[in-house]
Interface confidence: medium
Amino acid sequence: SRIDQDNSSFDSLSPEPKSRFAMLDDVKILANGLLQLGHGLKDFVHKTKGQINDIFQKLNIFDQSFYDLSLQTSEIKEEEKELRRTTYKLQVKNEEVKNMSLELNSKLESLLEEKILLQQKVKYLEEQLTNLIQNQPETPEHPEVTSLKTFVE
Amino acid sequence: SRIDQDNSSFDSLSPEPKSRFAMLDDVKILANGLLQLGHGLKDFVHKTKGQINDIFQKLNIFDQSFYDLSLQTSEIKEEEKELRRTTYKLQVKNEEVKNMSLELNSKLESLLEEKILLQQKVKYLEEQLTNLIQNQPETPEHPEVTSLKTFVE
Amino acid sequence: SRIDQDNSSFDSLSPEPKSRFAMLDDVKILANGLLQLGHGLKDFVHKTKGQINDIFQKLNIFDQSFYDLSLQTSEIKEEEKELRRTTYKLQVKNEEVKNMSLELNSKLESLLEEKILLQQKVKYLEEQLTNLIQNQPETPEHPEVTSLKTFVE
């Protein structure tokens, strides 16, 4: 760029002057240097302004995107809280259902015990009945009657 | 910085000139000012370019990080949706299990009633059997046979 | 801005010089240009420095905000993981409760079958008992004894 070329030509300005007056060529060199510097500065200003504008534009876009992302994150956080509440309710409900199952199991065990007791009672009745049937007379005529008949005859 | 020092020394350029020609010292002051300005501008350009490059680099990193964070947020949102679906399925399943438990309880109550009826039946049978046992003859010989024996003798 | 005005006035510097010496007016124009350029550069430097500082400040704020948002996102991700684990545990627990209910149902069905078998056994006992009661003698005196009495008399 015009700016980057060193203006070291200025140093050659009448190193050993014989006169107290400035030469036109020297002034022209100066003027040219000034012109170049002005143009360089103008370009740099223009370019820098553009870049800074771009940066600010990008920063604004970032700002907006950031805001959107923050909103989204807050939304997710909120939904996550809601989900956490739902999950907690589910845990409570699950615990209730588990307790219900345990209670059912308890009732079932109780019923099973009652059934066992009932079964034992039925077995006991059956044995008593079997004994009773076995002790019943086999024939309609009693042996005492038969012997008596013989005796009388 | 060289730029920040005011170039007010230019104002002392032959305020009351006796000649129409420029003095070499004046031009040298000018040339020196121009040189200083050039160097100052060069430094500033270099420094500003570096800073703007840094900024753009940082913006690029931000852009990438932002993109990554956005992806991560989208991913979280997606996983959260999935989690919501899973939680919903769990709620449905929980409800099913609860209904299953209620149905089981209903079956159990019904079975309990049947068991009570059966137990009452067993108790009734037991009483009948007890009566039957109590009405059985105590001795093997009937009293009628004994009296008949006596009568015959 | 002062910079944006073109310094083309320098080109009018004695295009056809009759003398080899510089005119004071020309040097003054140069000096004025140099002064303007210096002021312009000073303004621009000041303004650019301010803007770049603003940008860096904004970038730092972004950096911090970004860090916070990243932390928040990581936190959400962590909580989401935790929630996923909880949901998984819930699924397992739900499955356990479901299996418990199925097992309970199986026990219940088995108990129902046992109860039916027991009921049939009771019915059989009841019939046996009924037969036994029906086969009991109606009167305390046996028919053989009566006929024998008649015979003896």
């Epitope: 209670e103 015990e113 009652e114 066992i116 006991y124 | 068991k115 009570i116 | -």
Partner: antibody, heavy 114, light 112 residues
Framework: QVQLVQSGPEVKKPGASVRVSCKAS???????ITWVRQAPGQGLEWMGW????????DSAPKFQGRVTMTTDTSTTTVFLELRSLRSDDTAVYYC????????WGQGTLVTVSS | DVVMTQSPLSLPVTLGQPASISCRSS???????????LNWFQQRPGQSPRRLIY???NRDSGVPDRFSGSGSGTDFTLKISRVEAEDVGVYYC?????????FGQGTKLEIK
Amino acid sequence: QVQLVQSGPEVKKPGASVRVSCKASGYLSDFIITWVRQAPGQGLEWMGWISTYSGDTDSAPKFQGRVTMTTDTSTTTVFLELRSLRSDDTAVYYCARGRLFDYWGQGTLVTVSS
Amino acid sequence: DVVMTQSPLSLPVTLGQPASISCRSSQSLVYSDGNTYLNWFQQRPGQSPRRLIYKVSNRDSGVPDRFSGSGSGTDFTLKISRVEAEDVGVYYCMQGTHWPYTFGQGTKLEIK
């Protein structure tokens, strides 16, 4: 923690009735409560059972017609009533949980004396 | 009714020594569900009975592992591997297979 707490000692005259209570706590839902008695210096004797769930009862043949077992579900308390008391009914009466007696009450001494 | 016979009725034991109580039933105690409902109870002096063993060999929670139950059909045994002072009391076997339920007459364990 399962606990069965019984009522205090009783002194009764022959022919009278006695009512012993047994309050259950610390366990879910319903169980069978069994009654067992122990005469002084003697062994254990099974008397019968009651279901706190259905209210069903059953007693050993020796006590049938003389014993009544009831339950109050609101207070989870079970009662044993023994009528027509004789001197040989003097014993410590225990309530126990379940068909196979996994937890026992502290016992209630019933003395039948004229 | 099923008769439960315990032996010995009195058992003097030295602390740290093993002890064994036998219980015989007049009928097999195997129930139709495959289980054998034979329990062992401990009654310390002045206390309520406490179940030690259920279904022949299952130790109740809180019962020291020096207590063990074994047996099948009509013959059952309660063993104490090393008797301690707190084991003094009367031990009862009880059947829960046949209605009505019956207990053994008890074995008194005392320290020599």
